[in-house]
């Protein structure tokens, strides 16, 4: 009779993560008597995958009933495949021996490759806000994919970016891989509503790439412009001075009025108006009783925006002359007001 052969008909098997892999193996003879075992890898470090008589293998089932007297089908199924299961699997026939069974013949091996989807890309921006014209870095990370080939693109508001660097790790063979990319983005004043998108394409995604986004509203700081104007007389000896705070973001803003360098009033921006580009405007009024002053008054509007050093704008109020209109509110959208009397 011809000597037993162990046949593994599939040189390779490709399985998606989470699915079941079927590894086929048949023997050409019932002799010699002895069990079949499955291993991953070869040599002394090989890993036992299945032993039909002994050991615990909860993920493995046999395709046929190995207890049937004339069974020569030793195929197995491995459930819930992960990238860690990738490797070459050998079906090995043992003959009964004493004290231990002796390896008799091995199949040629079946290479199991696992396709695993990348995780959803996570985009993170700089820790601190930056102002327009500055360049900021965004990172994008995705993990756990296999095979290694992957494509990553960056977009800002739908426009593809070119200034980025990407690494796929590890460089050598691995059960799964990770991608890390850093893109440089130049901020503009119009970026409050902008989005940065990281797009990852992989064979497991069937042409439907994964995207991760970051809103530039979390990254940008648009400093305000200030304008202090004197309004027409409201009543005898009273002058209304406004401080218009324009085009700022984020909303966190504190305004202080100073009369001749002395703090007169401090308030926090509340009823702001939003511009189309996402920035805010705000206006504060100060009612000054001119008769309370003998000399000219220097009024200063001081603004602290988003924890940054204060910026200020001053206006000189002449007391000697009869108060008259010295300016007007020309910005139609500046309707927010905070009126206080100072006596």
């Amino acid at each position: 009779e011809e000597e037993l052969q162990v046949i593994q008909p599939d040189k390779s098997v490709l399985v998606a993560a989470g699915e079941t892999a079927t590894l086929r193996c048949t023997a050409t003879s019932l002799i010699p008597v002895g069990p079949i075992q499955w291993f991953r890898g070869a040599g002394p470090g090989r890993e036992l995958i299945y032993n039909q008589k002994e050991g615990h293998f909860p993920r493995v089932t046999t395709v046929s009933d190995l207890t049937k007297r004339n069974n020569m089908d030793f195929s197995i199924r491995i459930g819930n495949i992960t990238p860690a299961d990738a490797g070459t699997y050998y079906c090995v026939k043992f003959r009964k021996g004493s004290p231990d069974d002796v390896e008799f013949k091995s199949g040629a091996g079946t290479e199991l490759s696992v396709r695993a989807k990348p995780s959803a890309p996570v985009v993170s921006g700089p820790a601190a806000r930056a102002t327009p014209q500055h360049t900021v870095s965004f990172t994008c990370e995705s993990h756990g994919f296999s095979p290694r080939d992957i494509t990553l693109k960056w977009f800002k508001n739908g426009n593809e970016l070119s200034d980025f660097q990407t690494n796929v790790d590890p460089v050598g063979e691995s059960v799964s891989y990770s991608i890390h990319s850093t893109a440089k983005v130049v901020l503009t004043r119009e970026d409050v509503h902008s989005q940065v998108i990281c797009e990852v394409a992989h064979v497991t995604l069937q042409g439907d790439p994964l995207r991760g986004t970051a809103n530039l509203s979390e990254t940008i700081r648009v400093p305000p412009t200030l304008e202090v104007t004197q309004q027409p007389v409201r009543a005898e000896n009273q002058v209304n001075v406004t401080c218009q705070v324009r085009k700022f973001y984020p909303q966190r803003l504190q305004l202080t009025w100073l009369e001749n360098g002395n703090v007169s009033r401090t308030e926090t921006a509340s009823t702001v108006t939003e511009n189309k580009d996402g920035t805010y405007n705000w206006m504060s009024w100060l009612l000054v009783n001119v008769s309370a002053h003998r000399d000219d008054v220097k009024l200063t509007c001081q603004v602290e925006h988003d924890g940054q050093p204060a910026v200020s704008k001053s206006h000189d109020l002449k007391v000697s002359a009869h108060p008259k209109e010295q300016g007007s509110n020309t910005a139609a959208e500046n309707t927010g007001s905070n009126e206080r009397n100072i006596y």
Epitope: V33, P44, G45, R46, E47, L48, Q52, K53, E54, G55, H56, F57, D65, L66, T67, K96, P99, D100
Partner: antibody, heavy 114, light 108 residues
Framework: EVQLQQSGAELVKPGASVKLSCTAS????????MHWVKQRPDQGLEWIGR????????KYNPKFQDKATITVDTSSNTAYLQLSSLTSEDTAVYYC???????WGQGTTLTVSS | QIVLIQSPAIMSASPGERVTLTCRAS???????LYWYQQKPGSSPKLWIY???NLASGVPARFSGSGSGTSYSLTISSMEAEDAASYFC?????????FGGGTKLEIK
């Protein structure tokens, strides 16, 4: 549900023999080996041997080679452990264990005493 | 035969404490064939960890196993009262199959 039901406690005189049984249910009896393990009071575990119910092939721990005989009756899905020439050293709990090492019988207490 | 030596033979641990039990083999054992069991008084042993590092069904995630060659360990990341038991390592890499002498783990 997989179950290994072992025979009840035994009190035996020194020099005698005893045959312990282990009846399997809930799985194909010929699928895997059946092992026997000894545990003396407050001691560790000792592997006695195993049998392949499919063909009756046995392997023993050399220490128990002359003490233990493992057999099976596939018609009743039962494995047996026969212990001979009993001494006080054989006083122990004996477990039958399915080849997957997950399923253990409840144990049979053997007391050897005159 | 492969002799398995467990240490310590007995130990106490406080709740929340990290515990490591070791098992040394007299000759190399392939990691696929190294198992651990938990046994409580009056009960049969339960398979606890198989193939060195895989937790058996129902075993809490605070348990882990590691090792290769002749050195293996079972670790409890944060000891709980219900973990008080005896733990045995076991090899079925070669005949005769052998067990370690066990570690009795008590709660302080």
């Amino acid at each position: 549900e997989v179950q290994l039901q072992q025979s009840g406690a035994e009190l035996v005189k020194p020099g005698a023999s005893v045959k312990l049984s282990c009846t399997a249910s809930g799985f194909n009896f010929e699928d895997t080996y059946m092992h026997w393990v000894k545990q003396r009071p407050d001691q560790g575990l000792e592997w006695i041997g195993r049998i392949d119910p499919a063909d009756g092939d046995t392997k023993y721990n050399p220490k128990f080679q002359d003490k233990a005989t493992i057999t099976v009756d596939t018609s009743s899905n039962t494995a047996y452990l026969q212990l001979s020439s009993l001494t006080s050293e054989d006083t122990a709990v004996y477990y039958c264990v399915r080849g997957n090492y997950v399923n253990w019988g409840q144990g049979t207490t053997l007391t050897v005493s005159s | 035969q492969i002799v398995l030596i467990q240490s310590p033979a007995i130990m106490s641990a406080s709740p929340g404490e990290r515990v490591t039990l070791t098992c040394r083999a007299s000759s190399s054992v392939s990691s696929s064939y190294l198992y651990w069991y938990q046994q409580k008084p009056g009960s049969s042993p339960k398979l606890w960890i198989y193939s060195t590092s895989n937790l058996a069904s129902g075993v809490p995630a605070r348990f882990s196993g590691s090792g290769s060659g002749t050195s293996y360990s079972l670790t409890i990341s944060s000891m709980e009262a219900e973990d008080a038991a005896s733990y045995f390592c076991h090899q079925w890499y070669s005949y005769p199959r052998t067990f370690g002498g066990g570690t009795k783990l008590e709660i302080k």
